[in-house]
């Protein structure tokens, strides 16, 4: 988790002087509770936006937006803590809005936004906005949280972001797999425009089961420039095991931008349809 272009962060708006600060996610009001605390945020919304860095890179960001309730507690609102928790790693990043002037009621509802948390493809986040100071122990909670899932690199809009392109999202191998005679598979795919090697990972399964009955790895050396965007054809020999008929072919590229952590593409060959076999007729008939 990180912030995009940290030096450009602003939270001031007409009628409010405000500064954005790094936060340890442990506001001082936890340790030194105040008697009077503000109410919780209203209408917290999290949206996926896309933002360019000053270097021109494009990143997915969490756009966080919320409003204030129209009650007198805004007189005691000193700021807000924004927290983003990545659920699969438990990594948390926080920033603090510090109000440098007192809020006053005005003719329209106070609204705040922040769009600088960079999020990763195919990750789920819990976004929390805590009004400050935080409540006293056993006080009413004054935060709001939302869970938010970011699409993966297969998503059309995500595909062109820098993290996705770095992991090879623009490469479409258009894999085809056909079953040949004599227990062989022909795998064909389009090479990318980079002199890098590939690996074909073959995993075979019985018809209705998910534990593998055969595994094989095939190395494809780096193509020459004249072979870029051409089709590569590989014939794989299968183990002659009856019923080991469902084959998953996965192609792993080793592009320079993602090394051994590039997006993999796969194709599956299903078992052939079995005709319904009639009950065998016994070749003798019992007489009793």
């Amino acid at each position: 988790l990180r912030l995009l272009d940290h030096r450009a962060l602003v939270c001031s708006q007409p009628g409010l002087n405000c500064t954005v600060k790094n936060s340890t996610c442990l506001d001082d009001s936890w340790i030194h509770p105040r008697n009077l605390t503000p109410s919780s945020p209203k209408d917290l919304q999290i949206q996926l936006h896309f933002a360019h860095t000053q270097q021109g890179d494009l990143f997915p960001v969490a756009h966080i937006e919320w409003t204030l309730q129209t009650d007198a507690s805004i007189l005691y609102l000193e700021g807000a803590e924004l927290s983003v928790l990545q659920l699969n790693t438990n990594e948390r990043l926080c920033v603090r809005f510090e109000f440098l002037s007192k809020l006053r009621h005005h003719h329209r509802r106070w609204r705040f936004t922040f769009s600088h948390f960079v999020v990763d493809p195919d990750q789920e986040y819990e976004v929390t906005v805590h009004h400050l100071p935080k409540p006293i122990p056993d006080g009413d909670p004054n935060h709001q949280s939302k869970n938010f899932l970011v699409p993966d690199c297969e998503h059309a809009r995500m595909k062109v972001t820098t993290p996705c392109m770095s992991s090879g999202s623009l490469w479409d191998p258009n894999i085809t797999v056909e079953t040949l005679e004599a227990h062989q598979l022909r795998v064909s795919f389009t090479l990318w425009n980079e002199s890098t090697h590939y690996q074909i990972l073959l995993t075979s399964f019985p018809h209705m089961e998910n534990h593998s009955c055969f595994e094989h790895m095939h190395h494809i050396p780096a193509p020459r420039p004249e072979e870029f965007h051409q089709r590569s054809n590989v014939t794989l020999t299968l183990r002659n095991l009856k019923g080991c008929c469902r084959h998953q072919v996965q192609i792993q590229p080793f592009f320079s931008s993602c090394l051994n952590d590039c997006l993999r593409h796969s194709a599956t060959v299903s078992c052939p349809e079995m005709p319904d076999t009639p009950e065998p007729i016994p070749d003798y008939m019992p007489l009793w």
Epitope: D43, L48, L149, P151, A156
Partner: nanobody
Framework: QVQLVESGGGLVRPGRSLRLSCTAS????????MHWVRQAPGKGLEWVSG????????DYADSVKGRFTISRDNANNSLYLQMNSLRSEDTALYYC????????????????????WGQGTMVTVSS
Amino acid sequence: QVQLVESGGGLVRPGRSLRLSCTASGFTFDDYAMHWVRQAPGKGLEWVSGISWNGGAMDYADSVKGRFTISRDNANNSLYLQMNSLRSEDTALYYCIKEKSLGYCRGGSCSDAFDIWGQGTMVTVSS
């Protein structure tokens, strides 16, 4: 223009099944997460289920978990809700909803993340 059209509602006996469909037009369907929300007669809106852009993630309200299944067919711009073991308390007007942004707001506290609603299809569960 952007449009969502629900169908498949009707009168059904308790314990039976029904499949709701929603056809989308006017936007890139496979960019967005979709949800089903319902409103029982005289009651407020209740979120029922949601699904991510590619169907990789699905969520359900506790009241329908294990009985309802959400799915989508991006090739045909369609969203579905398979409703099994229907109960009288499932009687409601069911709405198909598109999310505002490209992410997927998970769980039931997402009403402010929705922007396009269909006109609804009525499901009545009665013996």
